[in-house]
Interface confidence: low
């Protein structure tokens, strides 16, 4: 029996398709949404239990350039007293987000995509204890 | 755009900047980390400021499964595991970029996309504002 | 080169169970995500279920969540699909597929094995 054909526009390549090289894609790095912006509440790194710092990496040969990355300030947790609670832990939360890396080789460029993981904020959580026998 | 340092024997047709359009391996540096934040972490479950998980999927966007994370209270978990309402749990979010087929459909021509995603939940003490 | 043999199709009663496997050959199995698609009788191709290199991810079609089960043995180099409470409009030829690097574009596809529901 002949494989099939695929019917449905799911899998399908269309004609109008833009010719690429094997093993490569195109890619076009003007960002769809460029002008969308983070609508995230006042100040929540520093109202939070579990506070965190920014600090940009900076990347001339990565594109986005500017990455922000973030850094729990503490160990434990702040209370209701404003004292750090070592018996919580702040801990951080990660997102993965691709960027594109420029490499030269001699006069040569070329492109990867990469994806990095980028530290977004911080969370309080109960430990998980291990009881040793 | 962004200037780059160019060794000064090249030819001078390298663009300093990123061009609009590039021709990009197929293969993705760090493709194999984990991205089901179910598998990787339990923070979900045992934050003060919980959350759950919902699942995103668009085939003409890589990666085409994101996850999106839904505070579960208003207030925060406290020591004897209820709600309190003194405190607020709100979401994190992040900006991140994608790959959207562009043509749609087209299996190796994409274009950069920019989106917002909730990624967890944190406990803040509220913004308390006193009418006069 | 590269090859895919799927196994294990045949006729069941609706309610019932069967278990597909896919032995691949050719190439690095634990570098992509494999698929499984249908094509029912004089009907076009359906997504199924894919699953990721590493194992730590499955999609499933909304027709067949709950119901179905995609799994991989990167060692054996095989996948496989546990179809439970199966029903007439289940009844196909199920191919499994390999992935682009990039999903849901096939560049290899198995001979294929029929699955007949009915009572």
């Known amino acids: 029996r002949k494989i099939p054909k695929v019917g449905h526009t799911f899998f399908q390549k269309p004609e109008s398709c833009p010719p690429v090289p094997g093993g490569s894609m195109k890619l076009d790095i003007g960002i769809i949404n460029e002008n969308q912006r983070v609508s995230m509440s006042r100040n929540i790194e520093s109202r939070s239990t579990s506070p965190w710092n920014y600090t940009v990496t900076w990347d001339p040969n990565r594109y986005p350039s500017e990455v922000v990355q973030a850094q729990c300030r503490n160990l434990g947790c702040i209370n209701a007293q404003g004292k750090e609670d070592i018996s919580m832990n702040s801990v951080p939360i990660q997102q993965e987000t691709l960027v594109v890396r420029r490499k030269h080789q001699g006069c040569s460029v070329s492109f990867q995509l990469e994806k990095v993981l980028v530290t977004v904020g911080c969370t309080c959580v109960t430990p998980v204890i291990h009881h040793v026998q | 755009g962004i200037t780059i340092p160019r060794n000064p024997g090249c030819p001078n047709s390298e663009d300093k900047n990123f061009p609009r359009t590039v021709m990009v391996n197929l293969n993705i540096h760090n493709r194999n980390t984990n991205t089901n934040p179910k598998r990787s972490s339990d923070y979900y479950n045992r934050s003060t400021s919980p959350w759950n998980l919902h699942r995103n999927e668009d085939p003409e966007r890589y990666p085409s499964v994101i996850w999106e994370a839904k505070c579960r209270h208003l207030g925060c978990i406290n020591a004897d595991g209820n709600v309190d309402y003194h405190m607020n749990s709100v979401p994190i979010q992040q900006e991140i970029l994608v790959l959207r087929r562009e043509p749609p459909h087209c299996p190796n021509s994409f274009r950069l996309e920019k989106i917002l995603v909730s990624v967890g939940c944190t406990c803040v003490t509220p913004i308390v504002h006193h009418v006069a | 080169e590269v090859q895919l043999v799927e196994s294990g199709g045949g006729l069941v009663q609706p309610g019932g169970s069967l278990r597909l496997s896919c032995a691949a050959s050719g190439f690095t199995f634990s570098s992509y995500g494999m698929y499984w698609v249908r094509q029912a009788p004089g009907k076009g191709l359906e997504w199924v279920a894919k699953?990721?290199?590493?194992?730590?991810?499955?999609y499933y079609a909304d027709s067949v969540k709950g119901r179905f089960t995609i799994s991989r043995d990167n060692a054996k180099k095989s996948l496989y699909l546990q179809m439970n409470s199966l029903r007439a409009e289940d009844t196909a030829v199920y191919y499994c597929?390999?992935?682009?690097?990039?999903?849901?574009?096939?560049?290899?596809w198995g001979q294929g094995t029929l699955v007949t529901v009915s009572s």
């Open positions: 597929a390999k992935g682009e690097i990039l999903p849901l574009y096939f560049d290899y």
């Open positions: 699953i990721e290199q590493d194992g730590s991810e499955e």
